[in-house]
């Protein structure tokens, strides 16, 4: 994918609200282009913080101001509403509400939108077409919550428009504005190390790959041209500079490490794979 983000592309906003007791609460709001955080919400000033120079996409200042106002009102409204109905809904303090909403793009076309609310980490209600529906497993509490949420039809209409119209328009503008950043190619660095000993007479070999962008990468321990199926890939982890880090490990008998190598394939290397040989690896550190 030319823009360095895996299909389907998504933009979503997450709202995590913690209710400690009737009067003490806090919230975290963030905006994400796939797995890249692009926005955050400053609760003190009730403003959207743009984390990348291109995070405004092609929206005007006026549009951003209106969205800020809407988010501010809805945040206040949500807090007040949840606090008001907490007892009726049998929400027991302390509890957490998580909301995620956004849209997906497939081959440049909108493939869908979503808005889901979870209570204590479990699916509770979701927004479908133009109204809130309970998850069947969530029971009567969720049904009652939907009844409350669906009282304001105009609010639901605007929510529907934000998901089906504003969000897809925003993604396209964001991709265009961030093209240079999202299409960049950053070469990985790789190095080898010992992992914690898995047992007597065995070694854990670790191949570290860091500083690469975009995210898709292939890392494998090899013996000659043969891939070692025992290779364990960790999660691809984000670095503070927007690049990625990955480690791949392999457990072997001490005498079988000599002709092993770690091979790294990445789009930035243009076919020139990085190959590091364990026998050349310095055991210092």
């Amino acid at each position: 994918n030319a823009d360095g983000l895996k299909e389907p592309l998504s933009f979503h906003v997450t709202w995590i609200a913690s209710f400690y007791n009737h009067s003490w609460k806090q919230n975290l709001v963030s905006g994400w282009l796939s797995d890249l955080q692009t926005h955050t919400w400053d609760s003190n000033s009730s403003t959207i913080v743009f984390l990348c120079p291109w995070s405004r996409g092609n929206f005007s200042n006026e549009e951003w101001k209106e969205l800020e106002t809407l988010f501010r009102i809805r945040t206040i409204r949500s807090f007040e509403g949840i606090r008001r109905y907490a007892h009726e809904l049998q929400f027991e303090y302390p509890f957490e509400i998580q909301v995620t909403g956004g849209c997906e793009l497939h081959s440049g076309k909108v493939s869908g939108s979503f808005l889901q609310l979870a209570y204590q980490g479990s699916d509770f209600v979701s927004f479908q077409n133009n109204s809130w529906l309970p998850y069947p497993v969530a029971g009567n509490m969720a049904k009652h919550f939907c009844k409350v949420l669906n009282q304001n039809q105009h609010e639901n209409d605007i929510t529907h428009n934000l998901l089906s119209d504003t969000c897809p328009r925003f993604i396209l503008g964001l991709l265009d504005a961030g093209k240079a950043h999202l299409q960049r190619q950053v070469k990985p660095e790789a190095w080898l190390s010992h992992g914690p000993s898995p047992g007597p007479g065995h070694l854990q070999l670790v191949c570290h790959v860091s500083g690469f962008y975009p995210k898709p990468v292939w890392v494998m321990w090899m013996r000659g041209e043969q891939e070692q199926q025992g290779t364990q890939r960790g999660d691809i982890l984000p670095s503070a500079d927007g690049t990625w880090y990955l480690r791949a490990t392999l457990e072997v008998a001490a005498g079988e490490a000599a002709d092993l190598s770690c091979r790294v394939k990445h789009s930035s290397l243009e076919g020139q794979d990085i190959v590091l040989y364990w026998e050349h690896h310095s055991s210092v550190g």
């Epitope: 006026e62 209106e66 106002t69 509403g81 039809q153 605007i158 428009n161 119209d165 504003t166």
Partner: antibody, heavy 116, light 107 residues
Framework: QVQLQQSGAELARPGASVKMSCKAS????????MHWVKQRPRQGLEWIGY????????SYNENFKDKATLTADKSSNTAYMHLSSLTSEDSAVYYC?????????WGQGTSVTVSS | DIQMTQSPSSLSASLGGKVTITCQAS??????IAWYQFKPGKGPRLLIH???TLQPAIPSRFSGSGSGREYSFSISNLEPEDIATYYC?????????FGGGTKLEIK
């Protein structure tokens, strides 16, 4: 900047119908709703209803369900209100207004006079 | 439907002075109230929404407060251009309804 340009004044006979327009500019038409409000001299303001241009769904005040029909054309960023079976009670100024968190921007109004 | 009772229906005040208008809803409207300024021959103007949030470019002489069923709107340091009719609107659920209006005159 946001602008709502309404069509000109209408003079109609009792029993006739009129269709007025509201052309929107300066914003993304499909993100917002379009509302209509009636103002009669010494009668105050009445909310007629709204259309969501994105989904074409409508919500009406019960008092106007059989009187007003709201439509929208996304290709021309224009909302319309059709008033049928006109009587002298329908003589008023009709405003269109953009809806988001509430009705924030309004048109200049279309005056309708029903007279025989 | 929710009824909005606005008072007074008219008032007269001096330049530089302060006026307050109230709206009482027939039931709790959860702070979903807006205030508008109507002037003859001009499109209406939204001044305040969600009880106390000022629209961009509206001077801070305008303010709003309230909760539940009782809401108020004030203009301080009155200026000649404030001569207008002011309306409250509730938009908590459908149908939205307006107050009867308050005509403001300058002494």
């Amino acid at each position: 900047q946001v602008q709502l340009q309404q069509s000109g004044a209408e003079l109609a006979r009792p029993g006739a119908s009129v269709k007025m327009s509201c052309k929107a500019s300066g914003y993304a038409f499909s993100t917002y709703t379009m509302h209509w409000v009636k103002q009669r001299p010494r009668q105050g303001l009445e909310w007629i209803g709204y259309i969501n241009p994105n989904s074409a769904s409508t919500s009406y005040n019960e008092n106007f369900k059989d009187k007003a029909t709201l439509t929208a054309d996304k290709s021309s960023n224009t909302a319309y209100m059709h008033l049928s079976s006109l009587t002298s009670e329908d003589s008023a100024v009709y405003y269109c207004a953009r809806g988001f968190y509430t009705m924030d921007y309004w048109g200049q109004g279309t005056s309708v006079t029903v007279s025989s | 439907d929710i009824q909005m009772t606005q008072s007074p229906s008219s008032l007269s005040a001096s330049l530089g002075g302060k006026v307050t208008i109230t709206c009482q809803a027939s039931q709790d409207i959860n702070k979903y109230i807006a205030w508008y300024q109507f002037k003859p021959g001009k499109g209406p103007r939204l001044l305040i929404h969600y009880t106390s949030t000022l629209q961009p470019a509206i001077p801070s002489r305008f303010s709003g407060s309230g909760s539940g069923r009782e809401y108020s709107f004030s203009i301080s340091n009155l200026e000649p251009e404030d001569i207008a009719t002011y309306y409250c609107l509730h938009y908590d659920n459908l149908p939205w309804t307006f107050g009867g209006g308050t005509k403001l005159e300058i002494k």
